[in-house]
């Protein structure tokens, strides 16, 4: 699902207040709900009728440094016999997420938000009949 | 997929540098790749064999203010005849994401990262035989 454009109003002080100096804001250290964890049913990526693989991307100047991307294994979906049925389609489920980008020059360190598209998994859909007859 | 614990080392300056004052850091205004958009196949939430509904949660002191949560519609999956097949299971796909929490007292505004669990969609899986026979 998509993150709306910021318009930067969210990060501005009220109009009656002095403006933010140097185009930056104060970000408190620490992460709220840091211990909260994804809890998904076991091995759904291989048990799904639209199975997927995971690829880990790593960037030490990004938080989180590890971003996991899913790739659907098949064009079609897996039927009860374990065979691919190409009358159905495996499609990716995408999510926009925020990460933090670290920029440093010597001892001067600043951070900036970055939007990343993550493919989280796949689902099996009935095809839309369109120009491909 | 899960965001690893920060250990706060990501946000610290190198050891040879003076520490961050007052437990806060400089966050630059603006979002990298802000115009990047999710491009998912149309209406997958209703065409999926494990369909879902969306619920929008809204918080003006969070960026993004709008967070969309998916809710699977069925226990089982929808078969080729459009009927629910409870020999298969609809299960949610979750993702950890970061949002920014705004805290203000008068003209003093600060921001903090917050981890949020988002259910992005649902997928159809073959059941593991356990307590639900």
């Amino acid at each position: 699902r998509k993150i709306p454009k910021v318009g930067h109003t969210f990060f501005q002080k009220p109009e009656s207040c002095p403006p933010v100096p140097g185009g930056s804001m104060k970000l408190d250290i620490g992460i709220i709900n840091e211990n909260q964890r994804v809890s998904m049913s076991r091995n759904i990526e291989s048990r799904s009728t639209s199975p997927w693989n995971y690829t880990v991307t790593w960037d030490p100047n990004r938080y989180p440094s590890e971003v996991v991307q899913a790739q659907c294994r098949n064009l079609g979906c897996i039927n009860a016999q374990g065979k691919e049925d190409i009358s159905m389609n495996s499609v990716p489920i995408q999510q926009e997420t925020l990460v933090v980008r670290r920029k440093h020059q010597g001892c001067s360190v600043s951070f900036q938000l970055e939007k990343v598209l993550v493919t989280v998994g796949c689902t099996c859909v009935t095809p839309v009949i369109h120009h491909v007859q | 997929r899960k965001i690893p614990k920060v250990g706060h080392t990501f946000f610290q300056k190198p050891e040879s540098c003076p520490p961050v004052p007052g437990g806060s850091m400089k966050l630059d205004i603006g979002i990298i790749n802000e115009n990047q958009r999710v491009s998912m196949s149309r209406n997958i939430e209703s065409r999926s064999t494990s369909p879902w509904n969306y619920t929008v949660t809204w918080d003006p002191n969070r960026y993004p203010s709008e967070v969309v949560q998916a809710q699977c519609r069925n226990l089982g999956c929808i078969n080729a005849q459009g009927k629910e097949d409870i020999s298969m299971n609809s299960v949610p796909i979750q993702q950890e994401t970061l949002v920014v929490r705004r805290k203000h007292q008068g003209c003093s505004v600060s921001f903090q990262l917050e981890k949020v669990l988002v259910t992005v969609g649902c997928t159809c899986v073959t059941p593991v035989i356990h307590h639900v026979q």
Epitope: M40, S41 | C72, R73, S90, V128, H131
Partner: nanobody, 123 residues
Framework: QVQLVESGGGLVQAGGSLRLSCAAS????????MGWFRQAPGKEREFVAA????????KYADSVKDRFTMSRDNAKKQVYLEMNSLKPEDTAVYYC????????????????WGQGIQVTVSS
Amino acid sequence: QVQLVESGGGLVQAGGSLRLSCAASGLAVSSYAMGWFRQAPGKEREFVAAISWISGGTKYADSVKDRFTMSRDNAKKQVYLEMNSLKPEDTAVYYCNDMPYGLDTRMDDYKYWGQGIQVTVSS
């Protein structure tokens, strides 16, 4: 924090009926299924029935099929278990719970349970 409050249990003769209620609060926005479970003395807790909040679709354990009916009231965030033709082997403490992965949920996925409600069926 999820809170679950079960009510409606009691003592009933074999062949009789009872209706259990469960009020759930603090559920996640994405919560999609609720279940009834039971634990008889000296036995493991077992699945009884499940329902989808959205579709109202249900699934039952073979031992209660055609005798028990699960329903829900979305506005009140309550689920119910109508129990007919009760047998002595239905005697147990009955619990309701959110099913975070629907029918894919395992007993060891649960972190918390309500107090439960005693149902005793005498012969």
